[in-house]
């Protein structure tokens, strides 16, 4: 058993029917010695008396808010949550496996630049009685600070018969060094509580591996005289790290016909302009990627040829 | 060329070669992004590689003030990786494919280090750890890890030379 926060405790259980469970001793936070009684949740049934209460925790029915009273007065509370270890593995019932980029990916994170700011998100089908808290650090043995905000519900989607909820959190490394080569990964730890079930999820990454620039901005076409060619130009996204002579991007320019089946023409360039042939009803798209490290491409920025 | 005393390197040549190094490092190990090597017990294997750290002056401001600290650090790393790529880790079993980019990568590391430090000038270099994995699978894993950290190292070096070529070239 360990303390998650004040008056909230997590009991770790080997989870199989008839498992012995854990013996837990609760102590009433009071100087009083006599006349103390204990109850669980909303029930008025007295579970025991005295300053301490010893219980055997085996099932969810044994978890919940234990309260000690004296003469009708509430003295203190202890909330017991269960963390299930099923068949040798801590349970992962609360969050959905996103399966990208590999199985057992519950947390996904992205950064728009090298400033040390990043966003993580996760999915669940649970809509109520759900709380998350997020901690992060750079490295684990001698951790350096990363500050995370509160997790918020960022999207709701209908998937078949189920509703899916996306939560996200923003974090910022306290003393980020954008130009340095990272040697210690960022660790992100999410505590999830659904009703009386506790679970924890972790992710470990380097900022360089989760970089995904915003799409290029101000995408413009300039027709070239007496030609089907156009000059496409664009700018670095505002959110990208500066100076651009140091934090450089490379770009992919694509000409795509109306039908998805039509052949796509692609040009790669380090410049912020390119000359392409604009076909009727086609569109021109540009996306960006770090020039020197193959992290994710940005989403496409597009303009119609006409 | 970078002389320990402090003259400038051939920024544009260094930029071109370091960008080539980036391309080669990724073609040598392209699937790296899909493989979490940190799960594979990091032990002491690649912990000793020289990293370009915050105080090494490789940021735009540090380069403007005095690029020598940063160039020395990059040189140190290039020599370190050049020795690793020429070691038993890469020459032993399982043999690399004949068209593997590792050979080119090795030569380019040497080329860039020589651009930074011509004959007769000596910056102190870092000892390379004696890593001699006994099993072919350990060697394979170590190759992945070394190439993975090399990708990060050359990315920073390429940024340095690109910025130098754009802002510090005479």
């Amino acid at each position: 058993i360990w303390e998650l926060k004040k008056d909230v405790y997590v009991v770790e259980l080997d989870w199989y029917p008839d498992a012995p469970g854990e013996m837990v001793v609760l102590t009433c936070d009071t100087p009083e010695e006599d006349g103390i009684t204990w109850t669980l949740d909303q029930s008025s049934e007295v579970l025991g008396s005295g300053k301490t209460l010893t219980i055997q925790v085996k099932e969810f029915g044994d978890a919940g808010q234990y309260t000690c009273h004296k003469g009708g007065e509430v003295l203190s509370h202890s909330l017991l949550l269960l963390h299930k270890k099923e068949d040798g593995i801590w349970s992962t019932d609360i969050l959905k496996d996103q399966k990208e980029p590999k199985n057992k990916t519950f947390l996904r994170c992205e950064a728009k630049n090298y400033s040390g700011r990043f966003t993580c998100w996760w999915l669940t089908t649970i809509s109520t009685d759900l709380t998350f808290s997020v901690k992060s650090s750079r490295g684990s043995s001698d951790p350096q600070g990363v500050t995370c905000g509160a997790a918020t519900l960022s999207a709701e989607r209908v998937r078949g018969d189920n509703k899916e909820y996306e939560y996200s959190v923003e974090c910022q490394e306290d003393s980020a060094c954008p130009a340095a080569e990272e040697s210690l990964p960022i660790e992100v730890m999410v505590d999830a509580v659904h009703k009386l079930k506790y679970e924890n999820y972790t992710s470990s990454f380097f900022i360089r591996d989760i970089i995904k620039p915003d799409p290029p901005k101000n995408l413009q076409l300039k027709p070239l005289k007496n030609s089907r060619q156009v000059e496409v130009s664009w700018e670095y996204p505002d959110t990208w790290s500066t100076p651009h002579s140091y934090f450089s991007l490379t770009f992919c320019v694509q000409v795509q016909g109306k039908s998805k089946r039509e052949k796509k023409d692609r040009v790669f360039t380090d410049k912020t302009s390119a000359t392409v042939i604009c076909r009727k009803n086609a569109s021109i798209s540009v996306r960006a990627q770090d020039r020197y490290y193959s992290s994710s491409w940005s989403e496409w920025a597009s303009v119609p040829c006409s | 060329r970078a002389v320990p005393g402090g003259s400038s390197p051939a920024w544009t040549q260094c930029q071109q070669l370091s960008q080539k190094l980036c391309t080669l490092a990724w073609s040598a190990h392209p699937l790296v992004g899909h493989m979490d090597l940190r799960e594979e017990g990091d032990e002491e294997t690649t912990n000793d590689v020289p990293h370009i750290q915050c105080g090494d002056g490789c940021d735009p401001q540090g380069l403007r003030d005095n690029s020598q600290f940063c160039l020395q650090r990059i040189h140190q790393g290039l020599i370190f990786y050049e020795k690793l790529l020429g070691s038993d880790i890469f020459t032993g079993e399982p043999s690399l494919l004949p068209d593997s980019p590792v050979g080119q990568l090795h030569a380019s590391l040497l080329g860039l280090s020589q651009l930074l430090q011509p004959e007769g000038h000596h910056w102190e270099t870092q000892q390379i750890p004696s890593l001699s994995p006994s099993q072919p699978w350990q060697r394979l894993l170590l190759r992945f890890k070394i190439l993975r950290s090399l990708q990060a190292f050359v990315a920073v070096a390429a940024r340095v030379f690109a910025h130098g070529a754009a802002t510090l070239s005479p």
């Epitope: 199989y16 029917p17 008839d18 099932e59 099923e86 040798g88 | -």
Partner: antibody, heavy 114, light 107 residues
Framework: EVQLLESGGGLVQPGGSLRLSCAAS????????MGWVRQAPGKGLEWVSY????????SYADSVKGRFTISRDNSKNTLYLQMNSLRAEDTAVYYC???????WGQGTLVTVSS | DIQMTQSPATLSVSPGETATLSCWAS??????LAWYQQKPGQAPRLLIY???TRATGVPARFSGSGSRTEFTLTISGLQSEDFAVYYC?????????FGPGTTVDIK
């Protein structure tokens, strides 16, 4: 007390089908993963299939993949194993288990023979 | 699949003596290893899980040790009801796999 009671075994011809059931009692069935393990006469134990508490995730041994389907009805506290395209080598006692650890039923014998 | 090997295939022991059963995994299974006891005509019974933790109601004379690839089940002061077949099982990676079993019989 945890109890698991298998039923549905019997003699079936090769290529035939059987559906095994396992009625669970004495614990909160919907909270636990369940599985099927088999034991050929005089032989060792082999995992056949495994199902998570909600029923959404399942796993199968290669030897039965595509032929057997594990499912559960948490409202009825029952685990099922639908066995199709049965072969002689599927002959065994089939045990219902509470996940990879915990309790086992007494087993039901499936004989595949012409 | 992870292969489990057990040794010896048969162990002849006198009541009151100590029996030591070994189990090896073809690759690391961390501590995700269980030991089962099976008597003729009965279902297997869980004795040890997590390589070292005794299941509910299992007498203290049964103890497990080891991790990764090498595991041991020790039965000290063998009693008549302990003569049976003992299987080890890894549950680290699906498909979970059992060893071929060790028969402990009366010397």
């Amino acid at each position: 007390e945890v109890q698991l009671l298998e039923s549905g075994g019997g003699l079936v011809q090769p290529g035939g089908s059987l559906r095994l059931s396992c009625a669970a009692s004495g614990f909160t069935f919907s909270h636990y993963r369940m599985g099927w393990v088999r034991q050929a006469p005089g032989k060792g134990l082999e995992w056949v299939s495994y199902i998570y508490s909600s029923g959404g995730l399942t796993s199968y041994a290669d030897s039965v993949k595509g032929r057997f389907t594990i499912s559960r009805d948490n409202s009825k506290n029952t685990l099922y194993l639908q066995m199709n395209s049965l072969r002689a080598e599927d002959t065994a006692v089939y045990y219902c288990t509470t996940g990879a650890l915990g309790q086992w039923g007494q087993g039901t014998l499936v004989t595949v023979s012409s | 699949d992870i292969q489990m090997t057990q040794s010896p295939a048969t162990l002849s022991v006198s009541p009151g003596e100590t029996a030591t059963l070994s189990c090896w995994a073809s690759q690391s299974v961390k501590s995700n290893l269980a030991w089962y006891q099976q008597k003729p005509g009965q279902a297997p019974r869980l004795l040890i899980y997590g390589a070292t933790t005794r299941a509910t109601g299992v007498p203290a004379r049964f103890s497990g040790s080891g991790s990764r690839t090498e595991f041991t089940l020790t039965i000290s002061g063998l009693q008549s009801e302990d003569f049976a077949v003992y299987y080890c099982q890894q549950y680290d990676v699906w498909p979970f796999t059992f060893g071929p079993g060790t028969t402990v019989d009366i010397k």
